[in-house]
Amino acid sequence: NIDVCKLGTVTVQPAPVIPLGSAANISCSLNPKQGCSHYPSSNELILLKFVNDVLVENLHGKKVHDHTGHSSTFQVTNLSLGMTLFVCKLNCSNSQKKPPVPVCGVEISVGVAPEPPQNISCVQEGENGTVACSWNSGKVTYLKTNYTLQLSGPNNLTCQKQCFSDNRQNCNRLDLGINLSPDLAESRFIVRVTAINDLGNSSSLPHTFTFLDIVIPLPPWDIRINFLNASGSRGTLQWEDEGQVVLNQLRYQPLNSTSWNMVNATNAKGKYDLRDLRPFTEYEFQISSKLHLSGGSWSNWSESLRTRTPEEEPVGILDIWYMKQDIDYDRQQISLFWKSLNPSEARGKILHYQVTLQEVTKKTTLQNTTRHTSWTRVIPRTGAWTASVSAANSKGASAPTHINIVDLCGTGLLAPHQVSAKSENMDNILVTWQPPKKADSAVREYIVEWRALQPGSITKFPPHWLRIPPDNMSALISENIKPYICYEIRVHALSESQGGCSSIRGDSKHKAPVSGPHITAITEKKERLFISWTHIPFPEQRGCILHYRIYWKERDSTAQPELCEIQYRRSQNSHPISSLQPRVTYVLWMTAVTAAGESPQGNEREFCPQGKAN
């Protein structure tokens, strides 16, 4: 806080603003009749240097000239860029206890002359926008630097606007607030930027442009689409544009897509016909504009129009499968199943399915509509039956898909050979087979069908299936395949009027079961012991069980137990053993084995055979 220099003055030579690397002389002079006493020789002038309000140096040793008691000149060098404060103080040497008294001060700014501004770029957003230019100022000058943007053009007019850079703000862009209109489309404009500060000035090279070079059209607005005759594949996209637009770019894509369809339209006048849309599909549309065919810039993309194309009648054929079960000697239950059409085939919301079961000689026809993807009916066991299903939306129905109802596993000669199931990874199984050896008629197709081997799965869950062409002998099944679950897999070979099948179990990943089977009873019949058990609960099986093991040993024996290995069958829950001694107490238990290993043992049961065993 320097008082208004009552005691004296401070001056700087050559100037208070100097280029980097230059020296300056600071002179501090006392006003007449100011000082410590009537003895001027006791006046000592000192110069203090402050940077950011912090005292950094006493320049006592930098005196270059001294009029004892009246004035002193100090040379300052190596000043850093920016502002430095120098304060001159009066030190009265005969009174050591008094602090030096401020006389006056000065700020010296060190900087550089501005470089010529470069890379001038001007834009006008929209036909009614205003011209704004930006540039690269070059190195920081560390001084207040004024920039003047000057635009010259037709009608002998020059427009200019100014801004400045200092340590608080940067000036590298100016909006002139002036609009260039389309009537000047052919005119040339010249823009230049001049920079000036206390150490010099510089000017950019002139930058020449036309209206078309700098005007970026506003993005199109009010976008809408009209579908011709409610067509799902043809529509007219309409939008509003600025008047001078001659070129548009359209891009559109289904909402879940990752790549755009791109179209260029010349002189579209806010209208363009699209002919390749997918019915009943959510689309996103955007448009960009340009004022000139070859030059100029594209506008930003418009806001998206999101809309769904109308429905069209379904195409494609349904994938049908069925199950046949005899109810009694003259009736059978037919369960038809089909897969939903994919969206590109459904082309709308499927409202219902039309199902027909027909006896080939046309004696009987059963028809129904359902919203489900399955249908069950009881029909006579006599006659040859055929089924057909079609899918309907609001615009119409797909062509019906036909399938002959045959006895799927009725012909042993059509049974595929050497069926195997190998786990490929966590969620699929590779099924392979060999064709039937002595088929009477040609195989038209194979069906690979699978179902989880869990209680009630036949009644609760529809089957999963894959249609395989007759020249393929493998299928990778993945739909609804989960690890640690065992599936029954059937491979059907179908001819025109017959069917044969082979069955196998498989899993995609397996572990040793969590527990062993639970022995429920041990009974003695005709000198043999029958072991009965309950199967391991489905979640604890952890894959396909290959076999069970029954272990036994004499109670309190330390010898290794004996064992009997049984091939796993779901229907089997008891097994005889015949190598136990009578009137000896045995301990028995069971384990289960998957491809991954053996389960812990199940419950232990003691038993003492009574009769003559062996």
Partner: nanobody, 126 residues
Framework: QVQLQESGGGLVQAGGSLRLSCAAS????????IGWFRQAPGKEREFVAA????????IYADSLKGRCTIYKDNAKNTVYLQMNSLKLEDTAVYYC???????????????????WGQGTQVTVSS
Amino acid sequence: QVQLQESGGGLVQAGGSLRLSCAASGLTSSTYVIGWFRQAPGKEREFVAAIMLSGGTTIYADSLKGRCTIYKDNAKNTVYLQMNSLKLEDTAVYYCASGLIYRYSDFPRSQKYNFWGQGTQVTVSS
């Protein structure tokens, strides 16, 4: 109602300087432009310079560029035209005018300015 009042005209020797003032009142929007025109006897009205009150952009006719400066004093609602190195052909009545203008092509068009002052005479003698 917008009112414009020019002052500062007079007789000046060739090579001399003059500062014209235009005091404006009733301008309800900072988007106005204030411009100076001049009309010599027997000639059409000619654009000299203009200033945009909001952003401070200045527009000059090339005929006087380098010899005149237009600037404003917001506190006094006054726009000044400083003219230096005056020539005999600068003799004319100088008018101040205002309008809502932002198109480049419209600045020199007198019909785009809605309000006009009475004018002040500038005479340059040899």
